[in-house]
Interface confidence: low
């Protein structure tokens, strides 16, 4: 999906009002120094591409993020503010329902959500690039 035509300010508002708090809740009890940020993004569409990938694509050691509160709110925000996004996700959602993995918070998931926090912060700060 090409995130170029999303309403970035609306997505930013959704992040600031709820998604950011849900990410913090998920990470509660984890030291901020525990994970290094290894994933970056260069502009807002790129950030959303990386955010979508880390949030919804199962990875080795972490298959359960898509059912978390922050993930559901991320999906809702993208569906509302990115034209045509929900249509591209129908097949992926059906495939995910068939898997229905057990919900476990692994260290790998915590690391992945730490990366997500960094990507969201970067999404919110393109202003640094403006002189």
């Amino acid at each position: 999906y090409d995130f170029t035509n999303c309403d970035f300010e609306k997505i930013k508002a959704a992040y600031l009002s709820t998604i950011s708090k849900d990410l913090i809740t998920y990470m509660s009890g984890t030291k901020s120094t525990e994970f290094n940020n290894t994933v970056s993004c260069s502009n807002r569409p790129h950030c959303l591409t990386e955010i979508q990938s880390l949030t919804f694509n199962p990875t080795a050691g972490c298959a359960s993020l898509a059912k978390e509160m922050f993930a559901m709110k991320t999906k809702a925000a993208l569906a509302i503010w990115c034209p045509g996004y929900s249509e591209t996700q129908i097949n992926a959602t059906q495939a995910m329902k068939k898997r229905r993995k057990r919900k476990v918070t692994t260290n790998k998931c915590l690391e992945q959500v730490s990366q997500l926090q960094g990507l969201w912060r970067r999404f919110n700060r393109p202003l640094l690039k403006q002189q």
Epitope: N37, S40, C41, R121, N124, L128, K129, Q131
Partner: antibody, heavy 117, light 111 residues
């Protein structure tokens, strides 16, 4: 392993231009920004400018009229060009990788530039 | 531009004691709950090395005797217990807005 290596001319005559190349490895210039910082002998660190992952730049206002930072992503190289050099531009010039939070997590060893006739 | 005022300019600390370095910013470097203040160590003839990022986060591979604290405009770097190898110049740097700026440096001598 992330590495940056500066290569410069060493000696530049006053009023001439300085060109330094920063060659990076272990990361992609399309994912992270590269900053230039200089340090005159016996003095502190001075930020010159940055070229971001998407190719946009920011320059320190004190250098904006004579500084240019460009890059070649395919060659993993970043270029600094500083025009109209004076003796007080004598310094060690460093390139440094920017992190996702914009601090400088890896630095090159630096290249010493002397401006003298 | 954000001006960073570091103090003291130099200090001498006995081996095993605590070294405290202050950095005051001319305006807040906080953004969305993060304090974008960083600390670097530079030894003679070497390039700077990142110690602490975003006010209090210890860079990977840096000994736990280094710690950072503060928010808004007032920040502190603590080294305890000080070791011989900590003799160096320490710089604070803000990454909250461009132009990025550094403090003038604090030279630490071990007695």
């Amino acid at each position: 392993q992330v590495q940056l290596r500066e290569s410069g001319p060493g000696l530049v005559a006053p009023s001439q231009s300085l060109s330094i190349t920063c060659t990076v490895s272990g990361f992609s210039l399309t994912s992270y920004g590269v900053n230039w910082v200089r340090q005159p002998p016996g003095k502190g660190l001075e930020w010159l400018g940055v070229i971001w992952d998407d190719g946009t730049t920011n320059y320190h206002s004190a250098f904006i009229s004579r500084l240019s930072i460009t890059k070649d992503n395919s060659k993993s190289q970043v270029f600094l060009k500083l025009n109209s050099l004076q003796t007080d531009d004598t310094a060690t010039y460093y390139c440094a990788k920017g992190s996702i939070y914009w601090y400088f997590d890896v630095w090159g060893a630096g290249t010493t530039v002397t401006v003298s006739s | 531009d954000i001006v960073l005022t570091q103090s003291p300019a130099s200090l001498a600390v006995s081996l095993g004691q605590r070294a405290t370095i202050s950095c005051k910013a001319s305006q807040s470097v906080d953004y969305e709950g993060d304090s974008h203040m960083n600390w670097y160590q530079q030894k003679p003839g070497q390039s700077p090395k990142l110690l602490i990022y975003v006010a209090s986060n210890l860079e990977s591979g840096i000994p736990a005797r280094f710690s950072g604290s503060g928010s808004g405009t007032d920040f502190t770097l603590n080294i305890h217990p000080v070791e011989e190898e900590d003799a160096a110049t320490y710089y604070c740097q803000q990454s909250n807005e461009v132009p990025f700026t550094f403090g003038s440096g604090t030279k630490l001598e071990i007695k």
